[in-house]
């Protein structure tokens, strides 16, 4: 009985198509597959950013795979050939590993890259990113932002920069069609006549950085002698009602402060007949049904009722 062996895939490489972190891993079939013509060969691919503790593992019948990486760090990958038992008289056979790495040669010292990068997707409509210049860079340094997400043919440069003292310190993005629920890649690089500038790479999903507008049309409705219903409306814009959580702050007679988090556009408050003044504010955030994270809106305008009779049927302001 001769031991069945199979070679690793050939020409294993990581290809950067210029998508700012979305890379192609590709390979060719192993040499000497003639013995296994009737076989469906599979490949086990393991890959990670250098420094990560865990490998991501996939098995595929293809000769390529695509995924996103952090280009601030290097990437390492390895692959081997798998033959299922049907090909080999009942034993599983795997080749040795073929390995490859990829990294972008860094220019400039780390301190020259942008600091405090912050991106907010306002009301699920307008993306704005801002940053501070690198530490110790001269005023002639300018930063440029590029972005890509699946659906764009190539990476695009920002066309509407926010400037301070002649330097780009942010970007107002155009309308981003079909850009949520997928990885959004950004590179901020820079140029200076004096010294090279380190590039920075960022990846996020837009639905996770949404800052909604605050709720509107706050009203009171007396439900019973000891209950008042607080109501408000969802903010204008594309975010559906099912995507909101709300936080309410209620103040009675300038003393009692009640804070509550609710999923609907109403909150029922227990009151006493002695209550003379009632004020509340509400803010909104995208909930876990529509995103993994989010940013609280600003507080709404304060809505107050004050007067002699809190038992009126409807209290509007």
């Amino acid at each position: 009985d001769t031991e069945i062996k199979v070679n690793p895939p050939q020409d294993f490489e990581i290809v950067d198509p210029g998508y700012l972190g979305y890379l192609y891993l590709q390979w060719q079939p192993p040499l000497s597959l003639d013995h296994f013509k009737e076989c469906t060969v599979e490949y086990e691919l393991k890959y990670r950013n250098i420094g990560s503790e865990t490998w991501k593992t996939i098995i595929t019948k293809n000769l390529h795979y695509k995924d996103g990486f952090d280009l601030n760090k290097g990437i390492e990958a390895k692959i081997h050939t798998l033959l299922p038992w049907q090909c080999t008289n009942g034993s599983e056979v795997q080749s040795s590993w073929a390995e490859t790495t990829y990294w972008i040669s860094p220019q400039g010292i780390p301190e020259t890259k942008v600091q405090d990068m912050d991106c907010v997707y306002y009301n699920w409509q307008y993306l704005l990113c801002s940053w501070k210049p690198g530490i110790g860079v001269l005023l002639d340094t300018n930063y440029n932002l590029f972005y890509w997400y699946e659906g764009l043919d190539h990476a695009l440069q920002c066309v509407d920069y926010i400037k301070a003292d002649g330097q780009n310190i942010g970007c107002r993005f155009p309308y981003l069609e079909a850009s949520d629920y997928k990885d959004f890649y950004i590179c901020v690089n820079g140029s200076s006549e004096n010294k090279p500038i380190r590039s920075s790479y960022f990846t996020f999903q837009l639905q996770n950085i949404v800052k909604p507008l605050p709720p509107v049309y706050l009203t009171f409705t007396r439900e019973s002698s000891c209950e008042i219903k607080l109501k408000w409306s969802i903010p204008l814009g594309p975010i559906p009602a099912r995507c909101f959580d709300y936080e309410i702050e209620i103040r009675e007679d300038d003393t009692t402060l009640v804070t509550a988090t609710v999923e609907n556009e109403t909150y029922t408050l227990k009151t006493t007949n002695e209550t003379r003044q009632l004020c509340f504010v509400v803010r909104s955030k995208v909930n876990i049904y529509c995103s993994d994270d989010g940013i609280w809106s600003e507080w709404s305008d304060k809505q107050c009722w004050e007067g002699e009779d809190l038992s009126k049927k409807t209290l509007l302001r």
Epitope: I59, K61, N62, P84
Partner: antibody, heavy 121, light 108 residues
Framework: EVQLLESGGGLVQPGGSLRLSCAAS????????MSWVRQAPGKGLEWVSA????????YYADSVKGRFTISRDNSKNTLYLQMNSLRAEDTAVYYC??????WGAGAFDYWGQGTLVTVSS | DIQMTQSPSTLSASVGDRVTITCRAS??????LAWYQQKPGKAPKLLIY???SLESGVPSRFSGSGSGTEFTLTISSLQPDDFATYYC??????????FGQGTKVEIK
């Protein structure tokens, strides 16, 4: 005749553990890869985990990684799923399934009858 | 992950009808697709593998076609025993193995 018979399901509190078993007969158990697939009440099918015939390689869905462990005892013709840190969303009928062809997963040509796992306080 | 999308979600048909269910993959999966039939309270049953190969013992009125991202399951003449839920499944690249959300074939 190929048969797969699951057992070990039941009611468990959130955070608890269960071990499912799948007794196989009617085929050479040590050869094919095997998988666990689950189905929450009124929902579709969700693949959970796979193991190669030798048991040398295992694969998991992200939703169970780090909490569930698949294993097999080829001398006993039995597949296992150890489920720890159970959550309400793990409530489902759990099926073991035999892989028709392939290294770790593929089309599933035989399925067990399923065992119900209910995670509730 | 490769997403599998079936259409329609529900299909009303009569005995004798020709029924077609579509499955779309979010990226090419070559021909690495299976179709299953499931009846209430029962385990799924393999009908088609490798997109178009009929599993042993499955009636010839069932057929599969397609490659790449578009696949169809066809029942040439619907029989009373065929009212069930049907699932597609890709096994091109994993983990995870992914299933479509299911198509329920009900009596019109």
């Amino acid at each position: 005749e190929v048969q797969l018979l699951e057992s070990g399901g039941g009611l468990v509190q959130p955070g608890g553990s269960l071990r499912l078993s799948c007794a196989a007969s009617g085929f050479t158990f040590k050869l094919p890869a095997m998988s666990w697939v689950r189905q929450a009440p009124g929902k579709g099918l969700e693949w959970v985990s796979a193991i190669t015939g030798s048991g040398g390689s295992t694969y998991y869905a992200d939703s169970v990684k780090g909490r569930f462990t698949i294993s097999r005892d080829n001398s006993k013709n039995t597949l296992y799923l150890q489920m720890n840190s159970l959550r309400a969303e793990d409530t489902a009928v759990y099926y073991c399934a035999k892989v028709r062809y392939g290294w770790g997963a593929g089309a599933f040509d035989y399925w067990g009858q399923g065992t119900l796992v209910t995670v509730s306080s | 992950d490769i997403q599998m999308t079936q259409s329609p979600s529900t299909l009303s048909a009569s005995v004798g009808d020709r029924v077609t269910i579509t499955c779309r993959a979010s990226q090419s999966i070559s021909s690495w697709l299976a179709w299953y039939q499931q009846k209430p309270g029962k385990a799924p049953k393999l009908l088609i593998y490798d997109a178009s190969s009929l599993e042993s013992g499955v009636p010839s009125r069932f057929s599969g076609s397609g490659s790449g991202t578009e696949f169809t399951l066809t029942i040439s003449s619907l029989q009373p025993d065929d009212f069930a839920t049907y699932y597609c499944q890709q096994y091109d690249t994993y983990p995870p193995i992914t299933f479509g959300q299911g198509t329920k074939v009900e009596i019109k």
